[in-house]
């Protein structure tokens, strides 16, 4: 009786179960009653990452330097190439098909997490007691100067964008 379903890593064709091709190989010819499935390796620029019956391998992703991309991990016959972005840039999507410059945190905001090749800068508002007076992709919020430790007093209060201004203590009492 011909099978109606096949085991894992097999497929049904012409009422018989044939082995799928292993990752890194493509289908050349189905199995027969006399022979196993004919599979052949993907070429150097191609891959297949699953047990399959594909007659063509997939092309490795091209990390286009014109789009700011570079190779993070070279593809094999079983894996695709992984692209990342050049210094100062990050991917626009999870599949990393193009890159954009990291954003800078505006004055009043500091860097919570520095950008990587795959993620953008994460900014956070400077809380009370901290400030940032620059637009930067690296600088965190800095604490206000402590006038007291310098034996000075606050002459001008700090904001999220400016440091406090310290001055000498009023000696007239």
């Amino acid at each position: 009786e011909p099978p109606t379903a096949c085991r894992e890593k097999q497929y049904l064709i012409n009422s018989q179960c044939c082995s799928l091709c292993q990752p890194g190989q493509k289908l050349v010819s189905d199995c027969t009653e006399f022979t196993e499935t004919e599979c052949l390796p993907c070429s150097e620029s191609e891959f297949l990452d699953t047990w399959n019956r594909e007659t063509r391998c997939h092309q490795h992703k091209y990390c286009d330097p014109n789009l700011g991309l570079q190779v993070q991990q070279k593809g094999t016959s079983e894996t695709d190439t992984i692209c990342t972005c050049e210094e100062g840039l990050h991917c626009t999507s999870e599949s990393c098909e193009s890159c954009v410059p990291h954003r800078s945190c505006l004055p009043g905001f500091g860097v919570k997490q520095i950008a990587t090749g795959v993620s953008d800068t994460i900014c956070e508002p400077c809380p009370v007691g901290f400030f940032s007076n620059v637009s930067s992709a690296f600088e965190k919020c800095r604490p206000w100067t402590s006038c007291e430790t310098k034996d000075l007093v606050v002459q001008q209060a700090g904001t999220n964008k400016t440091d406090v201004v310290c001055g000498p203590q009023d000696r007239q009492r």
Epitope: V28, D30, E38
Partner: antibody, heavy 117, light 111 residues
Framework: EVQLEESGGGLVQPGGSLRLSCAAS????????VSWVRQAPGKGLEWVGS?????????YYASWAKGRFTISKDTSKTTLYLQMNSLRAEDTATYFC?????????WGQGTLVTVSS | DIVMTQSPSSLSASVGDRVTITCQAS???????LSWYQQKPGQAPKLLIY???TLASGVPSRFSGSGSGTDFTLTISSLQPEDFATYYC????????????FGQGTKVVIK
């Protein structure tokens, strides 16, 4: 029944052209490579070329066949073709089609091509 | 292109004999793409062995294939009357020239 049947052979003059057909039954060209092999009278087997699985299929040829011989297929009709141009006396042979590429699992009975004036 | 040289080109043997046919490649090759065929007069070839040593289903176990590098062997352990035929090796240069080549054949005749 799984089988291959060649047709289109015959007598042709030197310099002439001929198109051989290979009709498949019981299997699908979209998932099977197919090859052409020839055998001159009283001689050994000689690979002509192959076409890979898939709807279009990549083609591979023996160096002597490149440019003169063309393999194609019509997946919907499960028919394989061998277009032979600029035929010479030394192309006289029985032409077989066979399923597969690196190993040939099923063969037709062959069709005889005679190139003579 | 890789050249496959079979030897001997013909051999005389008797029923029950152990017969060895060799196929030598002009360069080292992958055994994955080496096959052996049997052809009887007036018939199409028949696949016996593929991947150098895998026996096609239905082929008697007296046939075996072995070898690596440049030297490959087809062995018939005990020759039977129906084994008198011509035998061919085939190699496909996959991944390089993609060309397939047959050996010139070995004819096994009755002594």
């Amino acid at each position: 029944e799984v089988q291959l049947e060649e047709s289109g052979g015959g007598l042709v003059q030197p310099g002439g052209s001929l198109r051989l057909s290979c009709a498949a039954s019981g299997f699908d060209f979209s998932t099977n490579a197919v090859s052409w092999v020839r055998q001159a009278p009283g001689k050994g087997l000689e690979w002509v070329g192959s076409i890979s699985a898939g709807s279009s299929g990549s083609t591979y040829y023996a160096s002597w066949a490149k440019g003169r011989f063309t393999i194609s297929k019509d997946t919907s009709k499960t028919t394989l073709y061998l277009q032979m141009n600029s035929l010479r006396a030394e192309d006289t042979a029985t032409y077989f089609c066979a399923r597969g590429y690196t190993y040939l699992t099923l063969w037709g009975q062959g069709t005889l091509v005679t190139v003579s004036s | 292109d890789i050249v496959m040289t079979q030897s001997p080109s013909s051999l005389s043997a008797s029923v029950g004999d152990r017969v060895t046919i060799t196929c030598q490649a002009s360069h080292s090759i992958s055994s994955t793409y080496l096959s052996w065929y049997q052809q009887k007069p007036g018939q199409a070839p028949k696949l016996l062995i593929y991947r150098a040593s895998t026996l096609a289903s239905g082929v008697p176990s007296r046939f075996s294939g072995s070898g690596s590098g440049t030297d490959f062997t087809l062995t018939i352990s005990s020759l039977q009357p129906e084994d008198f035929a011509t035998y061919y090796c085939q190699y496909t240069d996959y991944g390089s020239s993609y060309v397939s080549t047959f050996g010139q054949g070995t004819k096994v005749v009755i002594k």
